[in-house]
């Protein structure tokens, strides 16, 4: 039985340079308890894009659009996109602990950047 699903509905998103990119993610349960974080790339060299609890992410805002009972919205918007922002973005659920441990990742959304 699946305990929880992390759903990134968009396999890819294309955004013009200078515009904002919305990266969608919904999660089907708060259990196991623990935070949601966004990363660009996978593996040990991945880059933290957003963590609500700590850090400063001036280009990122949260975008909660879903009012459905069956899931919760953990989508983000990244402003002023540049070609350097291209890559695959992952919405990742962690299980609370010391330290928190990765529990489940979404399938990823590939962001491509078009010229203005």
């Amino acid at each position: 039985e699946e305990e929880l699903q992390v759903i990134q509905p968009d396999k890819s998103v294309s955004v013009a340079a200078g515009e904002s990119a919305i990266l969608h993610c919904t999660v089907t349960s708060l259990i196991p308890v623990g935070p949601i974080q966004w990363f660009r790339g996978a593996g040990p060299a991945r880059e933290l894009i957003y963590n609500q609890k700590e850090g400063h992410f001036p280009r990122v805002t949260t975008v909660s659009e879903s009012t459905k009972r069956e899931n919760m919205d953990f989508s983000i918007s990244i402003s002023n996109i540049t070609p350097a922002d291209a890559g695959t973005y992952y919405c990742v659920k962690f299980r609370k602990g010391s330290p928190d441990t990765e529990f489940k990742s979404g399938a990823g959304t590939e962001l491509s950047v078009r010229a203005k």
Partner: antibody, heavy 118, light 112 residues
Framework: EVQLVESGGGLVKPGGSLRLSCAAS????????MSWVRQTPGKGLEWVAT????????YYPDSVKGRFTLSRDNAKNSLYLQMNSLRAEDTAVYYC???????????WGQGTTVTVSS | DIVLTQSPASLAVSLGERATISCRAS??????????MHWYQQKPGQPPKLLIY???NLESGVPDRFSGSGSRTDFTLTINPLQAEDVATYYC??????????FGGGTKVEIK
């Protein structure tokens, strides 16, 4: 129609044990996070325990941690709360409640009364 | 622990008028722009019943005279217009990712 039916409440002496059960019907039990919430006239509503849909993860407030154990049997659509080392302050109406997303409590049973007294 | 303070503890409102209940959290219950604050109605001898989930979403089957609003630490449940069957005690509840989950102390709504 969703139904949650609690049983197992009663009078027990301090230090004693009780096992509460909750029989679920009318929904896909194995997809739901399940919890117990208790209510006393003095303290109001208090969250007591939560278990993940597959039964892997359990959570308790400090007030019951180490004394209460929550489990489930998805094949039987049943939830169980084993309560040990009971104290007078555990006296309450205990409600079984479902949480589709592990967030709000969607459905509640009618409750079962636990009285801890010598 | 996140403490939820409801006010007033009791409220008497005339039929057809507006009833407003406040719930203040000791710290934010918002995650990614969603407020994990919920409202329940409890009538004597009955279990609580979900009215509003995640601050402002009306649970299926609940009359639209009930509404919820607020974010971060300040939340409101409004009943407008109040009807006789709304006499009950109302509770707020937070389910942020910081355990333990907690409830407000309740607000008893009566008819003036």
């Amino acid at each position: 129609e969703v139904q949650l039916v609690e049983s197992g409440g009663g009078l027990v002496k301090p230090g004693g044990s009780l096992r509460l059960s909750c029989a679920a019907s009318g929904f896909t039990f194995s997809s739901y996070v399940m919890s117990w919430v208790r209510q006393t006239p003095g303290k109001g509503l208090e969250w007591v325990a939560t278990i993940s849909s597959g039964g892997t993860y359990t959570y308790y407030p400090d007030s019951v941690k180490g004394r209460f154990t929550l489990s489930r049997d998805n094949a039987k659509n049943s939830l169980y709360l084993q309560m040990n080392s009971l104290r007078a302050e555990d006296t309450a109406v205990y409600y079984c409640a479902s949480q589709l997303t592990g967030s709000e409590f969607d459905y509640w049973g009618q409750g079962t009364t636990v009285t801890v007294s010598s | 622990d996140i403490v939820l303070t409801q006010s007033p503890a009791s409220l008497a409102v005339s039929l057809g008028e507006r009833a407003t209940i406040s719930c203040r959290a000791s710290e934010s219950v918002d995650l990614y722009g969603t407020s994990f604050m919920h409202w329940y109605q409890q009538k004597p001898g009955q279990p609580p019943k979900l009215l509003i989930y995640r601050a402002s979403n009306l649970e299926s089957g609940v009359p639209d005279r009930f509404s919820g609003s607020g974010s971060r630490t300040d939340f409101t449940l409004t009943i407008n217009p109040l009807q006789a069957e709304d006499v009950a005690t109302y509770y707020c509840h937070q389910s942020s990712d910081e355990l333990p989950w907690t409830f407000g102390g309740g607000t008893k709504v009566e008819i003036k």
